[in-house]
Interface confidence: low
Amino acid sequence: AQEVQQSPHCTTVPVGASVNITCSTSGGLRGIYLRQLGPQPQDIIYYEDGVVPTTDRRFRGRIDFSGSQDNLTITMHRLQLSDTGTYTCQAITEVNVYGSGTLVLVTEEQSQGWHRCSDAPPRASALPAPPTGSALPDPQTASALPDPPAASALP
């Protein structure tokens, strides 16, 4: 069965720094989403080989990509306190397969010592049910994403 290997499990970084999240699979994908989990999960990026990546307005200009959709490294730059959260890779095959998640803790520089990542990965039970639609806009669209609906026709 298809699996998504995601790293790191957790990282603590100061405001303004960057973080790399790597999503690796055995191939056979249509594309890959990076989703920020929470009460209202958000699609951050959609990446597909040979296509201009689509990025949520909140992260536009702050995300770089390297590799391919089968082994993708997503670099998030100029992190803000509000970027703290768990990010999970969602590989699109015939079924939606999730990575284990990356907990990103963005801290004020002087308070880094108060926040530590444990060795345990984020709990898989925190992952949402696979969505049947995505709210990502076209790459050139400047509007912010609405909350992802249960199902939608993409633009």
């Epitope: 594309g31 597909e48 080989d49 040979g50 296509v51 689509t54 939606n96 995505s134 026709a153 993409l154």
Partner: nanobody
Framework: QVQLQESGGGLVQTGDSLRLSCAAS????????MGWFRQAPGKEREFVAD????????LYADSVKGRFTISRDNLKNTLYLQMNSLKPEDTAVYSC??????????WGQGTQVTVSS
């Protein structure tokens, strides 16, 4: 208005070949991921093959690997499915579909393929 119109189905013998076409209007096939699905009587719709939006990768169901080939002609705005070495279990209604991201947004009505033994 988006329309996907399949053609090329028919009745063939085991081991024969067919080429299905899917003519698109209202969308540009080179800007969409395009795929083929099939549904046999009394069964759920089944993925057959797709070609990525960028055109650089294709996916096939295990049951058709090595026998079916998906392709598209951007100038004709048409998707194709070349089906070789057909088997009775390939009998189904074949539909093409288009997706902008991961979810399939647009569907054709389908064309019947019947493989007799």
């Amino acid at each position: 208005q988006v329309q996907l119109q399949e053609s090329g189905g028919g009745l063939v013998q085991t081991g024969d070949s067919l080429r299905l076409s899917c003519a698109a209007s209202g969308l540009t096939v080179s800007s969409y991921g395009m795929g083929w699905f099939r549904q046999a009587p009394g069964k759920e719709r089944e993925f057959v093959a797709d070609i990525s939006r960028g055109g650089g990768s294709t996916l096939y169901a295990d049951s058709v690997k090595g026998r079916f080939t998906i392709s598209r002609d951007n100038l004709k705005n048409t998707l194709y499915l070349q089906m070789n070495s057909l088997k009775p279990e390939d009998t189904a209604v074949y539909s093409c579909a288009a997706r902008k991201y991961a979810e399939w947004n647009y569907w054709g009505q389908g064309t019947q393929v019947t493989v007799s033994s």
